[in-house]
Structure formats: C-alpha cells, structure tokens
Amino acid sequence: RPSRVYKPEGNTKRALTLKDILNGTFSYKTYFPNWISEQEYLHQSEDDNIVFYNIETRESYIILSNSTMKSVNATDYGLSPDRQFVYLESDYSKLWRYSYTATYYIYDLQNGEFVRGYELPRPIQYLCWSPVGSKLAYVYQNNIYLKQRPGDPPFQITYTGRENRIFNGIPDWVYEEEMLATKYALWWSPDGKFLAYVEFNDSDIPIIAYSYYGDGQYPRTINIPYPKAGAKNPVVRVFIVDTTYPHHVGPMEVPVPEMIASSDYYFSWLTWVSSERVCLQWLKRVQNVSVLSICDFREDWHAWECPKNQEHVEESRTGWAGGFFVSTPAFSQDATSYYKIFSDKDGYKHIHYIKDTVENAIQITSGKWEAIYIFRVTQDSLFYSSNEFEGYPGRRNIYRISIGNSPPSKKCVTCHLRKERCQYYTASFSYKAKYYALVCYGPGLPISTLHDGRTDQEIQVLEENKELENSLRNIQLPKVEIKKLKDGGLTFWYKMILPPQFDRSKKYPLLIQVYGGPCSQSVKSVFAVNWITYLASKEGIVIALVDGRGTAFQGDKFLHAVYRKLGVYEVEDQLTAVRKFIEMGFIDEERIAIWGWSYGGYVSSLALASGTGLFKCGIAVAPVSSWEYYASIYSERFMGLPTKDDNLEHYKNSTVMARAEYFRNVDYLLIHGTADDNVHFQNSAQIAKALVNAQVDFQAMWYSDQNHGILSGRSQNHLYTHMTHFLKQCFSLSD
C-alpha cells in the first residue's frame, strides 16, 4: 500500500470506495482457541506456526513449526488427543457449502518426522481423530476406514460407498445443506470405543445436471442427486461399529422409532451421551414431528436398544418443529436428563429441562424473547445465548444459569462488558468450561477475549482489531441505527444505514436489502464494512434491512406466519416498511430500490412485481423462482408437499414467473451463476423465459462456472461493479 501523504489535521476523512470493499481492506479478525484440555489451547499464529498455550502456567511454545506446515503446503491441522501426532491438511478443494476434499499427512511429534508406510489415500473426504488416543477415522471414495494408529494399515468399515449413489460417513447434497450443516456424518463415542455413522442411499433420487464450461472444447456435466420438493428422498440408516474389534460384529444398525419409520423420514442429528449411550434425532418428512431417541448398548445382546420409554416427541401445531433446525440436547452429568430449546406454551423458544418425559419438562427460561443456543452444561452451570437483554431481538448475550442452586439463578455474563461496542456475542468453552473465549461481533469493532469460567473475569484480550481501528480512523463511516416500527399489531425491527453527513431535512435514495427467509435474521447488532456500507458512505444512499414475518427469534406467531404460504407476508412486510420509511420524510419516493440474494432474490423479485409502484428498480441475485425447484427438505419444511391434496396451489401461486407481467414498470437486474449447485440456474432461466414470453424488458448477467456464492475474486469484482453501475443509473447518481 502506498505510504500516506501527510495532511494537516481537520476533516481529512475520506469516503469508502468500492475498491476498499472488493479488496477486503477493512475486514476484521476473530480469535477462537482450539481447546485441547481444560486450560490449554492451540492457535495458528499470523506466521503459520501452531502455538501451544497454557492459561494457568502462562507457558507458550511452538508445537508445530511453519516450516513443517510449509513442507506439505498445509493450511490446517489437527492434534491427536494423546498429543503424539498431528494431521496436516493440504490441497483443499471445495465441494459444496461445507464439504471439501484434501490431502492429509500425519506428523509424529515424538520423532519429529512424517509417518511413513500406510500413508493416507488421496483425496480424503473427511478425517478425524478419536476423542482419546490416536485412532483415525476417515472417508475415502464414500467409504469409511479406521486406523488403530497412524502407521497401521487401514480397516475398511463400509463397502457400500459409490459415487453419487451411497455415502457413508459424509452427507449427500441435501443433508449437508439442509439438515446437518456439516461435511461429516460420523461421530466418535467419548471414549473412542464406538464410531457411529450414517449411510445415505441416493440411488433413487433424481439428478440435477448442469454444464461446467471450464477451458475444454466440450463442457463437463456436473451430476448431483438432488431431491427437489416432492421428489424421492435419500434413504438413511444409522450404524455403530465397535472400533476395538470392528471386524468381529461389523457395523450394528440402530433402530428407527416406529412412529417415525411408518412414513418418509429424516435423520436429523446424533449426540453421544456417554460411552455406551447415544441420542438420535429423527424427523418426519412432514417436518412438524421430531423424535429424540436415547439408545443404549446392550453388552449381552451386542446390540443397540432404543426403548420406547426413551423416545421423546416434539411436535409443532402451528408450523414446523424447531427453528431452522430442530435443536440438539445438552445432556447433564447423569447421562439421562438433558436441556433442550423448544417452544413454550406462548410460542417462544426457551430452555427446558427433560428428566423423564417432554410432558413433564421443567421450563428453565421464559419471557417474550428467545433462548438461542446452549453452549455448555457443567456440573453446576449452564451457559446459553439469548436476545433477552433490553428487548433487542438482534442482539446476542451469553448467560450463565447456576443449576446447582434452587431455584436456579441467572447471570448475564456479557451484557455490561463493553456495552457500546459489544452487543452480539458467541463463545468457545474449554472442556468443562474452566475457561472460555468470548467473541464479540459488534456493533463496534469485533473483539475476542479470554475469561475465567468460574468468576467470568476477563483474563486476556486475544484480538482487538487495533490495526483495523487505526485504518478506519480516516474513513467516513455511515451511521447505523437499529429501531422498530409498528404497523397494526405488528412490530418490525429494522436497521438503517445512513450516509455520513446525513441530514433529515434532505431527500435520499433508499435501497432495501432483503433476505427474509424463514427463521433468518438480518437486523443484527454486528459490525460490517461491506458493499452497502460503501453505498451509504460514498454514494449517499440510505440502506434499510427489515425483519418481517417469518424471521427468527421473536416467537412462533411471527415465525410461523409464513407457514405454507411463502412469498406473501415476507413481501408485504417489506412494502409496509418502505411506506413507513417514506413517512419519515427523508426518502426520495422516486428513487427506491430493493435487492437480495438467494431467498432475498426471491423476495426482491416478488416485491418488484407487487404492482405497488414503490420501487423504481431492483436486483435479484441467484433467486429461487419456484419452491418446486428447490430442495425437498427446505421447501417442504415451510410449504408442505407440491401435491394436489397438500399445497400444490400455493406452490404454483408463489412463483416469480406467475408475476412476470408486473415487472413491466420496474428496472430489473437478474443475476445467477451457471454452476449454482444450490439454487439452480434453472430458477433464473425460468424467470427470464417468463419475462421474454410476457415481452417485458429486463437486464441480466450470468457468471459462468460460478456457484451460489459467486465467490471467485474476478466474478465478485465484476458483480459488485455491475450492481453499483445499475443502482447509480437507477438513482441518477453520477459516476
């Protein structure tokens, strides 16, 4: 970067440039310790050394040098629990949202050399250490392998794996994206004796096929088993193998609860409770019934038994079970009772304590706010996050409940730490929460700190983004407000990003940024310097984000309002908000735009086609255009099935194509990556076809070989430059 020319004090601040955003000039850092015990953790330093830290002895040393990392071009690592070996990960090759393949090398810390003989095959789809010792489980070509020690030959646990057909220990596309949100589907028992895994059989699933153009004379065809709404789904089976003598009994199948197995179903998660107790969660295809099943290993039978009296049913009568996903249980030390977040009688998601049956659950938190995540349950404390503090749904604070006390006492750990700077936290706990790290994401500059798990005392600042703070000193940042507006009986929270020299008496163009998907949240108290920050800072555009009905953490009445009728209230509430913003007096009614990506592209498209005349123009990036084109697990969760006797009518009514005529009076920019594995290019192709058939003029841009994120540097630069030109033209802003 060129050195700065000295300028005398005064208002020398400059506006953000698009280049700043595209270069990531103002990106922030977070610090998550890689915990390896109660008081020890690892962290990768700026210069790529892997450093060991002991909080109590204040000892720190390099456990793995950057030269060792560099010798195999490693970008990640994993220490074995016995601390004898480290796996080094290189040749990272992204597949879908979470999945990737890589090459793995095992480094022997004792000998100071790489383990030779029986090297791991490549590329590996997933690899992990056992929780104790140094056993390795890995997935290669859709099959699971086990090594008793890194230098040992591998034992092949599964033989059914087949590309695009049967997946063992890793999810298929739809489970990865819509159910597990992980790249793996295998879990070690706490003592490393058992390994549980899922087999996904996609043999009967229809294939989505699209061209990948590459550089060759002929394009390649990408084929993915992808169940769209109403299509055949993966068949799942859960197995557990004894890793001490895996060859004796082989994988043992875990039975599916009868009430689940009677029709199409999903596996939703697996939690080890103890070395011989496991908890599986299942979900009916119609996702309003979830069953949590606790299974025990019966030594005498050499089988996993899941008694009916250890099945706990969670059912929603107003929508779907859970939030975006069904919550997972946090078991107590007794390995029987557990804490879980689900809706209370008033429809707010709260922590409940389940000892025997769900009916007898004891509600631990309550109020017109929501418990969001249980981080850790220890002997005497439960740590969780919620949006209770001061009634702002878009905040996250960490709370501790002392469960030893009767009644349990509650303390907000984070509420008053750095109140102006920090209102949105997550946390990372050491093994028994003896220590924890807090990571604050905003609204001020992110900061990561280390704390004592008993006193909550701050021990150390791990990362405070000083460099970023310094470089932002000469930047004119916009002002950010989070407020609420009322309409009838409804309350909508919004975030408004106002240009630096904002003057209420003037008129400004307005850009609505929308996502709006079920159980999402856009109005969050987090720090960001991104494209919309630039638009406000440099181009003088007012930006607004509104959380309408269907969004999360404000109770089920608000959340489930969109159940079985997507595309209605999400749009209506954006329109309501725009009208309210106009009433505020500083919005130029002739210059209002809306943009969104993915679900936001769907909502922005429907808003533009609402026929209200509110919007002059808008952008949809990678929009869904019909719920029939999207993944079964997602579409059906919120819409039911696209069948005559279920909800086909609304599936048809809620398409963007059905509203093609209404785009006539707006400027519409439609953008999509041709290699979008998630929201297929088909969605935009169908919108374009409908607009052409209706003889409606529109603008479009495709990004060849780009996926749902349009992430390649060149594409992203082009995308944001293109959208900026479009908006500036729409708002008559000079270039």
């Epitope: 003989g117 029986y118 090594k147 008793q148 020690r149 040992d152 030959p153 034992f155 092949q156 033989y159 059914t160 089976r237 001490t244 003598y245 895996p246 060859h247 004796h248 009994v249 082989g250 994988p251 043992m252 199948e253 019966r298 005498d300 039978w301 050499h302 089988a303």
Partner: antibody, heavy 117, light 108 residues
Framework: EVQLLESGGGLVQPGGSLRLSCAAS????????MSWVRQAPGKGLEWVSA????????YYADSVKGRFTISRDNSKNTLYLQMNSLRAEDTAVYYC??????????WGQGTLVTVSS | EIVLTQSPGTLSLSPGERATLSCRAS???????LAWYQQKPGQAPRLLIY???SRATGIPDRFSGSGSGTDFTLTISRLEPEDFAVYYC?????????FGQGTKVEIK
C-alpha cells in the same frame, strides 16, 4: 449356550445347486454378522462369505462371487448359503461361524458338500 | 489379499514342552485383527486368541499370543496332551478374511 447347527450338505453334480442352513440359538442372532467358512478335505480354512446383522450388507470371497448368495432370516434365527454352479473345487466341509471377518468365536459342527459326477 | 504363512508346517514336541508357532503376513496387520484357532480332527475350529494377544473365554493361560505388524507368535508354555492339534492364524483386516495354512503340533 451358543449353538450353531448346519444342515443341507450332500452330494451334488458339477453345475448343480445346494442350499445350506445354519440354525442359531443362545445369542441375539440379529445383532451379529455371520460368516460361512469352508475346509476342503485335508486342507486349511477358507472364508467364503459374510452378512451383516440386519442382512443389508453381504460380502464374498472372489472364488464364489456371483455363484453363492448369503442370506438370513432373523425371525427364524437362521443363516443360509445358496450355492449355484457348483464346481469340484467347492467340495468341502462348510462351517457357519459367528462374526464378520473374525474373530469367529463360535462355529457350527460343519456340513459336508461333495461336488462330483 | 493378505497371505498368511505359518511355520513350521509341523512341530513335533513332547507333553510339557514349550511350543512356539509363527505366523507371517504378506503385509502389515494391526494386532487388533489377528486371531489364532485350534482344530482337532473331525471337529470345528475353536477360537484361542483374538487381538493378537487376548485369550478367548475359557482358554487356559498356557496359551499366549504376541506380535505386531507382519510377525505374530502363538506360544503354548507347557503342552498338555489335549493341545496336540492343528493351529491356524487368521486376519480380519481385509476382505477376504484369510487363514494361514496351519501348523500341526504332533506328539514326538
């Protein structure tokens, strides 16, 4: 007490078929993978085939692949081996054994299959 | 497939003597996957040792197993009259599971 009892052996012509059964008792049959191991007269032991506890996965030695089919009926606690296109080299005592790829902790007494014209 | 080679083919010993049987694998076998069996004429094999060194239920402690990688040993510390039989090693690491050709322990 664990017991495995094979039956169905006998004399068969080359190209013929035979179905062996193994009745199991004394343990939770459906929880265990089961195998067939054979022993040609005066020779060593050869693993032939295995099946998972649920019956969903089957495994074969190359020498019998495509000709032999292993199956089980967990409701009857019985293991089967359907042998088609039999050859002289399939002549052996066939044992059913408890386990997948070993260790085979329990064995039946064996049933003799003779393939001869 | 993994080939197991047992030696010697025959071992002639007297009761009370120590017997040492060897099993060599064509490629490394983690000790977890190696077992030893005893077979007497007209009888089914009987599991003696699993995991290279763990005795199966009811097996007298004169039988012991050791080894790792490619070399494994079955030791009978003091031969009893009922110990004269054929002994097989077996690996369960790979499909197909394979057995050694056997070592016959006969009375000298």
């Amino acid at each position: 007490e664990v017991q495995l009892l094979e039956s169905g052996g006998g004399l068969v012509q080359p190209g013929g078929s035979l179905r062996l059964s193994c009745a199991a008792s004394g343990f939770t049959f459906s929880s265990y993978a089961m195998s067939w191991v054979r022993q040609a007269p005066g020779k060593g032991l050869e693993w032939v085939s295995a099946i998972s506890g649920s019956g969903g996965s089957t495994y074969y030695a190359d020498s019998v692949k495509g000709r032999f089919t292993i199956s089980r009926d967990n409701s009857k606690n019985t293991l089967y081996l359907q042998m088609n296109s039999l050859r002289a080299e399939d002549t052996a005592v066939y044992y059913c054994a408890k386990g997948w790829l070993g260790p085979f902790d329990y064995w039946g007494q064996g049933t003799l299959v003779t393939v001869s014209s | 497939e993994i080939v197991l080679t047992q030696s010697p083919g025959t071992l002639s010993l007297s009761p009370g003597e120590r017997a040492t049987l060897s099993c060599r694998a064509s490629q490394s076998v983690s000790s977890s996957y190696l077992a030893w069996y005893q077979q007497k004429p007209g009888q089914a094999p009987r599991l003696l040792i699993y995991g290279a060194s763990s005795r199966a239920t009811g097996i007298p402690d004169r039988f012991s197993g050791s080894g790792s990688g490619t070399d494994f040993t079955l030791t009978i510390s003091r031969l009893e009259p009922e110990d004269f039989a054929v002994y097989y090693c077996q690996q369960g690491l790979n499909i197909p599971s394979t057995f050694g050709q056997g070592t016959k322990v006969e009375i000298k």
